[in-house]
């Protein structure tokens, strides 16, 4: 008697990048003999009850080819992670995992003046945001003079970066001899956000 088998072929790359709010379909083709008995898609130990379709290439008794599609709609930044397709028949089990990264525009989480005179900006997004600092003389909010940060840290670099990455950057405000506004600009491939901070230290956040 022939031993059963299952072979799974991803029809897209198993590492997927998708922009916040967009849709993505995870599609696999698989060969199974005997016929598959159980199929499921799993995310974070939760099984999808809908949002997926599974069907054979043909309905002949000799058919061994199948497709399964998981339809992910309007993905949020919090919905990145590992999505796994599992299939079994009477002889074997098989699985394939897709790592889904959701690209998100940076948001500025905090913007503070520390007691030691440092200005600190913390931003989150994916891919990892870059934070640039600019000084705006007087009351202008067109900031051109760039300021080098004293310290830059990625705060949550441990573990797989499926969620947003948090970056902290600091500058020394004692370098500024004139009244004005400081801009903290956080940006990545998706977009940019700025926070403006004047010397009365009133915070305003302006997404662009």
């Amino acid at each position: 008697v022939d031993k059963g088998f299952i072979n799974i072929f991803p029809m897209i790359n198993t590492t997927v990048f998708v922009n916040d709010g967009e849709n993505v379909d995870l599609i696999v083709e698989y060969e199974a003999f005997p016929k598959p008995e159980h199929q499921q898609w799993i995310y974070m130990n939760r099984t999808f009850t809908d949002k997926w379709e599974d069907y054979p290439k043909s309905e002949n008794e000799s058919n061994i080819r199948y497709v399964s599609e998981l339809h992910l709609t309007r993905l949020k930044g919090t919905e990145g992670g590992t999505y796994t397709f599992l299939v079994s028949n009477s002889d074997v089990n098989a699985a394939i995992a897709f790592n889904v990264y959701v690209n998100t525009k940076p948001e500025i989480l905090t913007y503070d003046r520390l007691v030691n005179g440092m200005l600190q900006c913390v931003a989150a997004g994916f891919p990892e945001p870059t934070i640039d600092w600019y000084f705006c003389p007087g009351t202008e909010q067109r900031c051109s003079a760039s300021v080098l940060p004293v310290d830059v840290q990625t705060l949550n670099s441990s573990g797989p970066p499926f969620g947003k990455l948090v970056v902290q950057s600091s500058i020394d405000s004692s370098a500024f001899k004139h009244n004005g506004t400081v801009e903290c600009k956080a940006y990545n491939d998706v977009g940019k956000t700025s926070a403006y901070f004047n010397f009365a230290f009133k915070e305003q956040i302006h997404p662009h």
Epitope: M11, I27, E29, E53, Y55, E69
Partner: antibody, heavy 117, light 108 residues
Framework: EVQLLESGGGLVQPGGSLRLSCAAS????????MNWVRQAPGKGLEWVSG????????SYADSVKGRFTISRDNSKNTLYLQMNSLRAEDTAVYYC??????????WGQGTLVTVSS | DIQMTQSPSSLSASVGDRVAITCRAS??????LNWYQQKPGKAPKLLIY???KLEDGVPSRFSGSGTGTDFTLTIRSLQPEDFASYFC??????????FGPGTKVEIK
């Protein structure tokens, strides 16, 4: 044997409506995503619309969005395309297709829609 | 939408020739690329799916290759029944599935 048979094409005036049907046989229709693809005379192929197996999700080409509606009746093994506000540029042979993954593995013979005054 | 281009738009070849048709996407589409054959007055027929997988019943002289933006359909030894038009199709963006303009293969 998988068969897809389109009907409902014909001559219609600009601004008019038409409903195409596609009768499916030889497979369990309710399990498969389905699509409409069209081909203007002497031109290339253009995907028009798609629908999931349950009928719960649909998608459209920008050129027909808001004018065309795809639907299906799994109990009748039939796919539909309701076409409203028809324009001369909608003149084409309309094909009903079955999806396998992201490819169209079976096609009907097509039905001709002519929009002309 | 992702734009698809094909080259050449037409070619003349003889029975037994090796023929290659190229398809290029305006952005990376991974391997979401399918090839179809169409004869005059007939519906298209799927030849290759997922860039390189041969559809059931299609002769092995047809093959597909490529990933990203550049793809090729190759007919190893052209047969009389292969004279037809060939279309590539991307299905990376859904909705937004698009076809190439086609390549007509004629008898020399």
């Amino acid at each position: 044997e998988v068969q897809l048979l389109e009907s409902g094409g014909g001559l219609v005036q600009p601004g008019g409506s038409l409903r195409l049907s596609c009768a499916a046989s030889g497979f369990t229709f309710s399990r498969y995503p389905m699509n409409w693809v069209r081909q203007a005379p002497g031109k290339g192929l253009e995907w028009v619309s798609g629908i999931r197996s349950s009928g719960g999700a649909t998608s459209y080409a920008d050129s027909v969005k808001g004018r065309f509606t795809i639907s299906r009746d799994n109990s009748k093994n039939t796919l539909y395309l309701q076409m409203n506000s028809l324009r001369a540029e909608d003149t084409a042979v309309y094909y009903c297709t079955r999806s396998f993954g992201r490819a169209f593995d079976y096609w009907g013979q097509g039905t001709l829609v002519t929009v002309s005054s | 939408d992702i734009q698809m281009t094909q080259s050449p738009s037409s070619l003349s070849a003889s029975v037994g020739d090796r023929v290659a048709i190229t398809c290029r996407a305006s952005q990376s589409i991974d391997t979401y690329l399918n090839w179809y054959q169409q004869k005059p007055g007939k519906a298209p027929k799927l030849l290759i799916y997922a860039a390189s997988k041969l559809e059931d019943g299609v002769p092995s002289r047809f093959s597909g290759s490529g990933t990203g933006t550049d793809f090729t359909l190759t007919i190893r030894s052209l047969q009389p029944e292969d004279f037809a038009s060939y279309f590539c199709q991307q299905s990376y963006s859904s909705p937004g599935i698009t076809f190439g303009p086609g390549t007509k293969v004629e008898i020399k």
